[in-house]
Amino acid sequence: DLKVEMMAGGTQITPLNDNVTIFCNIFYSQPLNITSMGITWFWKSLTFDKEVKVFEFFGDHQEAFRPGAIVSPWRLKSGDASLRLPGIQLEEAGEYRCEVVVTPLKAQGTVQLEVVASPASRLLLDQVGMKENEDKYMCESSGFYPEAINITWEKQTQKFPHPIEISEDVITGPTIKNMDGTFNVTSCLKLNSSQEDPGTVYQCVVRHASLHTPLRSNFTLTAARHSLSETEKTDNFS
């Protein structure tokens, strides 16, 4: 019996520009003889409906149709037909199909590959056109993919050290598509500093599919109104 197993859940997520390995494991009742078996990898785009061959391995012949594509022959001996693609691009997301032939048997498996780009985040203070004691803080997230993103604002006071989500005076603009296909978005928080306690810490919290944990940027309200911190970068997807 010949069987192929792909990534559990049927989806793999990889960071943009990464050297991705798309998993495909072969299960066969006998030891594999790589000179008498064949592996073909196919890719089907999300944006145009055509399936194309990415890589093929037959006996002593192997060919990469996509630049840099490789299946390791020595790993293949132990049943690992995983495909390695260097420098994965956003447009290469889609369905990947691993087809294995051990004559006369044939087996195949598919996996969805999602390519994600992590947002960069920064805090800006905009006082232009604002009334006295009024400040507008902007949290800019840029270069992320896919488009879905969640930006929230939180505050911590000395009285209430646990973060409280702010829902009033928050405006998050529309996502803007960049020329390279990634997205940007800005969220604004309007504050009346005269009504807030000095020492209050405000955070812009960005959640995105590419991030293991949220990206947090904070500033502290001081007697001199504000003190912007550097973005606290948390773990990016890897």
Epitope: F48, V52, F65, Q89, L90, K177, M179
Partner: antibody, heavy 119, light 108 residues
């Protein structure tokens, strides 16, 4: 072996049209995008447009929109570029090149066709 | 519309020297491709997706960069590296492919 073989040099009059060809071997053009790029004497590379031979969809650089037409004949594994209303400014080497899948990276190029527009 | 600006236009180096050429974009990009072209020949694929060397490219070449700034570096330049190097990107919004004007590398 993957190859893109282009048609021979052309000498044409201003105002005329020309059709350049690019025949692929070693792969099926339907699995790729075929692009056309030109290079004027002593100048850099300039993208003209691309075609998806699987469905005939084309995209052109705004400069060549309406003047360049890219087509394919999948039965002969050949791509064509028709360029009309030629001027001396179109004198250049024209390359066909392929990109594979979603890479947007030219992994194979033709040898180039020299087009001379002169009266 | 994204414009790619390569610098310098012209580079003169002695064998064994380290050289770096840059490609700057007017808008942030997520990757860059590079090609080598010698007089009378078609361009050759050289570096794919910022960092990855094309098949047959010597290991003395490397690519780096992110956002709006990308570079190609040759650690110890050799006579056969004399050529013009072009950067290239693809934008999806609107769909368009762009080349830089090229950096010509000459050996002393």
């Amino acid at each position: 072996e993957v190859q893109l073989q282009q048609s021979g040099a052309e000498l044409v009059r201003p105002g005329a049209s020309v059709k350049l060809s690019c025949t692929a071997s070693g792969f099926n053009i339907k699995n790729t995008f075929i692009h056309w790029v030109n290079q004027r004497p002593e100048q850099g590379l300039e993208w003209i447009g691309r075609i998806d031979p699987a469905n005939g969809n084309t995209i052109y650089a705004s400069k060549f929109q309406g003047r360049a037409t890219i087509t394919t004949d999948t039965s002969s594994n050949t791509a064509y570029m028709h360029l009309s209303s030629l001027t001396s400014g179109d004198t250049a080497v024209y390359y066909c090149a392929r990109t594979y899948g979603g890479t947007n990276y030219f992994d194979y190029w033709g040898q180039g066709t020299t087009l001379t527009v002169s009266s | 519309e994204i414009v790619l600006t390569q610098s310098p236009d012209f580079l003169s180096a002695s064998p064994g020297e380290k050289v770096t050429m840059t490609c700057r974009a007017t808008s942030s990009l997520y990757s860059m491709h590079w090609y080598q072209q010698k007089p009378g020949s078609s361009p050759k694929p050289w570096i794919y997706a910022t960092f990855n060397l094309a098949s047959g490219v010597p290991a003395r070449f490397s690519g780096s960069g992110s956002g709006t700034s990308y570079s190609l570096t040759i650690t110890r330049v050799e006579a056969e590296d004399a050529a013009t190097y072009y950067c290239q990107q693809w934008s999806t919004n609107p769909p368009k492919l762009t080349f830089g004007a090229g950096t010509k590398l000459e050996l002393k």
